[in-house]
């Protein structure tokens, strides 16, 4: 069965997916669907990769780690009921039949607390794995650890750099990453 | 539940041969790729072979390259280590370990035991 | 091939302490990372993936993080259970390569 990721509605999900390139710089490509992994390919394709880039990726779905070291991880910004369900990640490694396929499961949970205002989203956007739980288990609550020191005139800034897949996996490690068990 | 089983695990002599199985259960074998790791007395962990989910593309680091094989059968759910041209360095427990998408050795079995020795 | 240099080999604490191990990937590599706990004469458990988040089931005094291309397991409150030795490998890179271990004891 499935292994089942949750978020809440309004923060960001995060499906992980890894796998190694055969060489450095060697890289495989990767497709994230929703649904689960047909026969071949991906179906209803939200992010793709080649053997050098992203090559196609559509609005609120993005790869926030280092894709060329086989990290393909998928985040989904803002998420909604709707994101619920199956997410499949193929790497579509050369050969017959070779290619390795995970169903991810999303669950969407209403969310506990009230909006943030408009800078406080901003600012929750700039790490993009928080609050992202993992497991069959009940949900649990936790606060967030120590933050880097950022303040409200460089999460604007961050905001607009947040494509930039190594300035996000930079924040991502420095301790606002909070996942449950 | 994801199962792995190793078997095969015998004492063999320097220059002996050894085939060491896994039965795999409890997920989608063909979809999956798959490894051996071994760990040896110090208890130092050591990748020893990886094979894609069809069972093209085999990877194996220097030490072992061109003395073991790692192939598989996926009709029968099983993984495989044909290992050749043995040394006393290659005893070691040796593990079968299936990726996921979290990494290269996301479940492992309980391993078996080869150990070589004249 | 990148080395994963494990520090300590082996540390013994009491109940109740804070407890770090780390990993240092050579060449000035940053790798995706995870780290494993192996009680005795079990085998190898995923413990952390991504250099910092927690497998299922498995207890949030464990946390991972990073800082360039060193890697930090913490316990926050040292219990009798967690006695194991722990491992890190990088998979980001052929060959695969795990840290040496470091073994943890209960004082």
């Known amino acids: 069965s499935e292994v089942e990721y949750r978020a809440e509605v309004g923060q960001n999900a995060y499906l992980p997916c890894f796998y190694t390139p055969a060489a450095p710089g060697n890289l495989v490509p990767v497709c994230w669907g929703k649904g689960a992994c047909p026969v071949f390919e991906c179906g209803n394709v939200v992010l793709r990769t080649d053997e050098r880039d992203v090559n196609y990726w559509t609005s609120r779905y993005w790869l926030n780690g280092d894709f060329r070291k086989g990290d393909v991880s998928l985040t989904i910004e803002n998420v909604t009921l709707a994101d619920s369900g199956i997410y499949c990640c193929r790497i579509q490694i050369p050969g017959i039949m070779n290619d390795e396929k995970f169903n991810l499961k999303l669950v969407i949970k209403p969310a506990k607390v009230t909006p943030a205002p408009t800078r406080q989203r901003d600012f929750t956007a700039a790490f993009p794995r928080m609050l992202t739980t993992r497991g069959h288990g009940p949900a649990e609550t936790q606060t967030l650890g120590s933050l880097p020191d950022i303040n409200l005139t460089q999460i604007s800034t961050l905001a607009n750099e947040l494509r930039d897949s190594r300035l996000a996996n930079d924040l991502r490690d420095s301790g606002a990453t909070i996942r449950i068990g | 539940e994801v199962q792995l089983v190793e078997s095969g695990g015998d004492l063999v002599k320097p220059g002996g041969s050894l085939k060491l199985s896994c039965a795999a259960s409890g997920f989608t074998f063909s979809t999956n790729g798959m490894s051996w790791v071994r760990q040896i007395p110090d208890k130092r962990l050591e990748w020893v072979a990886t094979i894609s989910s069809g069972g093209s593309n085999t990877y194996y680091p220097d030490s072992v390259k061109g003395r073991f094989t790692i192939s598989r059968d996926n009709a029968k759910n099983t993984l495989y280590l044909q290992m050749s041209s043995l040394k006393s360095e290659d005893t070691a427990m040796y593990y079968c370990?299936?990726?996921?998408?979290?990494?290269?050795?996301?479940?492992w079995g309980q391993g078996t035991l080869v150990t070589v020795s004249a | 091939d990148v080395q994963m240099i494990q520090s300590p080999s082996s540390l013994s604490a009491s109940l109740g302490d804070i407890v770090t191990m780390t990993c240092q990937a050579s060449q000035g590599s940053s790798v995706n990372l995870n780290w494993f706990q192996q009680k005795p004469g079990k085998s190898p458990k995923l413990l952390i993936h991504g250099s910092n988040i927690l497998e299922d089931g498995v207890p949030s005094r464990f946390s991972g993080s990073r800082y360039g291309t060193d890697f930090t397991l913490t316990i926050s409150s040292l219990e009798n259970e967690d006695m194991a030795t722990y491992f890190c490998l990088q998979h980001s890179y052929l060959p695969y390569t795990f840290g040496g271990g470091t073994k943890l004891e209960i004082k």
């Open positions: 370990a299936r990726r996921s998408e979290l990494g290269p050795f996301a479940y």
